[in-house]
């Protein structure tokens, strides 16, 4: 399975969106969740709401928000407030029972910004304006790295 | 018409191979997880596994993990479970059934083929 | 895995009498559990999904209920065709179980 490397400003909002085959994951909540090392396990940040049809809701915990579009099989996940302990390896899942299926690995990586200690003046943009939309804005930065991932079956 | 046909009864010795499919038609076959459910003479219902034919991704059970093997062909709308060597125990009826999605989020098969049944005797 | 135990193994009915069939889960499966009816040299056929929901065509007289490890299905007024083997299954998580059944007979 690619890993999905996406970089985001420290103090902003970094989005990221999962794809999945709809109809196949159909009933099936999503969870992000956070890799501890390489083999450790993956430990839940947030998972979609509890009654499948009401997945759409954001459910968040702390500054991390999960909304999952069933139909069109898309789970969008939102890091606001992006800090450097961010940084790291996570998984979108889907779920089924005890059963977690990866759908996508990201690697996020915090950049410093720049501006951090200066006087911003009008180059402050609004939280909601810089946020990252995965591999799918173009000022984010993405690049895909192959790891081996064991079969499913 | 939404069904699944299933290929005859077969009768094999032990140690033989055999591939069983099931045809899916009247609806997107890549669309739908299709299961394999064994049923031994007189006994009651048991769940082999289940394919995705869209991208062939296989779940097992663990009782049937590594005894068979599911497959599809979606070129086809056909679903295979095989054996690779045959064993007396493995005498029973075989039905393929689609795991129809409710508005719920639950699924459950709702469109079972007329199963094949597998006589393995020497 | 989740076993799936149904009770009683047999259940000897007249027409017309109400049935009452039971499953019970080993661990929760909230409201992930269907019904299916099966009649000697058929198929399986889908009665009850989500616990309570009747399948298409399914007459008004088979009713499910139950969430979390308890189930039962009821025969309000049992048919002369209703004389078969019931058998619960859950979709909670893999693999997809079922139960042992619950074979209704004329008595």
């Known amino acids: 399975l690619n890993t999905t490397v996406l970089q985001g400003m420290a103090g902003q909002s970094l989005r990221v969106s999962c794809t999945y085959d709809a109809l196949k994951h159909w009933g099936r909540r999503k969870a992000w969740c956070r890799q501890l090392g390489e083999e450790g396990p993956c430990q839940r940040v947030v998972s979609t709401h509890g009654v499948w049809l009401l997945a759409f809701l954001k459910k968040r915990n702390g500054s991390t928000v999960i909304a999952d579009d069933t139909l069109a099989g898309t789970v969008t996940i939102t890091l606001k407030n992006l800090q450097a302990g961010d940084a790291g390896l996570y998984q979108c899942q889907s779920l089924r029972g005890r059963e977690a299926e990866v759908l996508q690995k990201v690697l996020v990586e915090v950049l410093e910004d720049p501006l951090d200690d200066q006087d911003a003046g009008d180059l402050w943009v609004p939280e909601e304006s810089s946020s990252f939309e995965g591999a799918q804005v173009e000022h984010s930065t993405s690049r895909n790295q192959e790891t081996s991932f064991p079969p499913t079956s | 018409e939404v069904q699944l046909v299933q290929s005859g009864a077969e009768v094999k010795k032990p140690g033989e191979s055999l591939k069983i499919s099931c045809k899916g038609s009247g609806y997107s076959f890549t669309s739908y997880w299709i299961g394999w459910v064994r049923q031994m003479p007189g006994k009651g219902l048991e769940w082999m596994g289940i394919?995705?034919?869209?991208?062939?991704?296989?779940r097992y059970s663990p009782s049937f993990q590594g005894q068979v093997t599911i497959s599809a062909d979606k070129s086809i709308s056909t679903a295979y479970l095989q054996w690779s060597s045959l064993k007396a125990s493995d005498t029973a009826m075989y039905y393929c059934?689609?795991?129809?999605?409710?508005?719920?989020?639950?699924?459950?098969?709702?469109?079972w083929g007329q199963g094949t049944m597998v006589t393995v005797s020497s | 895995e989740i076993v799936l135990t149904q009770s009683p193994a047999t259940l000897s009915l007249s027409p017309g009498e109400r049935a009452t069939l039971s499953c019970r889960a080993s661990q929760s499966v909230s409201s992930y559990l269907a019904w299916y009816q099966q009649k000697p040299g058929q198929a399986p056929r889908l009665l009850i999904y989500?616990?309570?929901n009747r399948a298409t065509g399914i007459p008004a007289r088979f009713s499910g209920s139950g969430s979390g490890t308890d189930f039962t299905l009821t025969i309000s007024s049992l048919e002369p065709e209703d004389f078969a083997v019931y058998y619960c299954?859950?979709?909670?998580?893999?693999?997809?179980?079922f139960g042992g059944g619950t074979k209704v007979e004329i008595k």
């Open positions: 059934a689609r795991l129809g999605r409710k508005p719920s989020g639950s699924v459950a098969f709702d469109i």
């Open positions: 989500d616990a309570s």
């Open positions: 394919i995705y034919p869209g991208d062939s991704d296989t």
């Open positions: 299954q859950q979709d909670y998580s893999w693999p997809y179980t």
